[in-house]
């Protein structure tokens, strides 16, 4: 036999205290699907959270984070402090990236610079705390016999004049 409550619409609940008639969700609660026997309490965006979307009778409130913080987790379940580019968040707060690592965002961890030599390439632009290195063409690409539609400009090494 079908549940007598199955047809109560979203925004209502099947009220057992009133012989299973449909009743509207009370203030600050919602039901996003039909046939509910209770309404869920609306999420409240407090403290470091701020309201992105108000709660309605059929949908929960949605939160994001106040400036200086960013969302983490499903549905922005946590707010984490922003750091500057070139930093990462540690237990002791924001710390500069160690030499050889970078972070180009306000969140996340510092990552190692790309090792250009692993691809047989040279470093065209040095890395910084905020930016990865830029790898240049491999020596093979610079040899006179290398076939290229538009040959790359030769990389200048510090202290060397062009041949």
């Amino acid at each position: 036999l079908q549940d007598p409550c199955s047809n109560c619409p979203a925004g209502t609940f099947c009220d057992n205290n009133r012989n299973q008639i449909c009743s509207p969700c009370p203030p600050n609660s919602f039901s996003s699907a039909g046939g509910q026997r209770t309404c869920d309490i609306c999420r409240q965006c407090k403290g470091v959270f701020r309201t992105r979307k108000e709660c309605s009778s059929t949908s929960n409130a949605e939160c994001d984070c106040t400036p200086g913080f960013h969302c983490l987790g499903a549905g922005c379940s946590m707010c984490e402090q922003d750091c500057k580019q070139g930093q990462e968040l540690t237990k002791k707060g924001c710390k500069d990236c160690c030499f050889g690592t970078f972070n180009d965002q306000k969140r996340g961890i510092c990552r190692p610079w790309t090792n250009c030599s692993l691809d047989g390439k040279s470093v065209l632009v040095n890395g910084t705390k905020e930016r990865d290195v830029v790898c240049g063409p491999s020596p093979a690409d610079l040899s006179p016999g290398a076939s290229s539609v538009t040959p790359p400009a030769p990389a200048r090494e510090p202290g060397h004049s062009p041949q």
Epitope: N7, R18, Q20, C22, P24
Partner: nanobody, 121 residues
């Protein structure tokens, strides 16, 4: 407190028409299904028609094409327009507030007190 108050009953000749009204209060009318039932003398109460909050309707075979159920959510009222009335339509007609907004296999949560319809020449 849920209240259902029927009106519009009376005596009518075969082939005639009547419109029953049911004024509802004490609950959120617009989100609930409403129904009409009837009980003839010496018989069991039987389903006549029902209307969902979304205005889907269901009718008993015996009244299809002759009776029309409708609702006015602004007035918290449900109606039963009855035409081509027959002697066998004679009964006390009850308004019912249905459980869970269901018109298929409906179950009544609250009843009105009824209004008598007599079809007689």
């Amino acid at each position: 407190e849920v209240q259902l108050l029927e009106s519009g009953g009376g005596e009518v000749q075969p082939g005639g028409s009547l419109r029953l009204s049911c004024a509802a209060s004490g609950f959120s009318f617009s989100i609930n299904a409403m129904g009409w039932y009837r009980q003839a003398p010496g018989k069991r109460r039987e389903f006549v028609a029902a209307i969902e909050s979304g205005r889907n309707t269901v009718y008993a075979e015996s009244v299809k094409g002759r009776f029309t159920i409708s609702r006015d959510n602004a007035k918290n009222t449900v109606y039963l327009q009855m035409s081509s009335l027959r002697a066998e339509d004679t009964a006390v007609y009850y308004c019912g507030l249905l459980k869970g907004n269901r018109v298929v296999s409906p179950s009544v949560a609250y009843w009105g007190q009824g209004t008598l319809v007599t079809v007689s020449s």
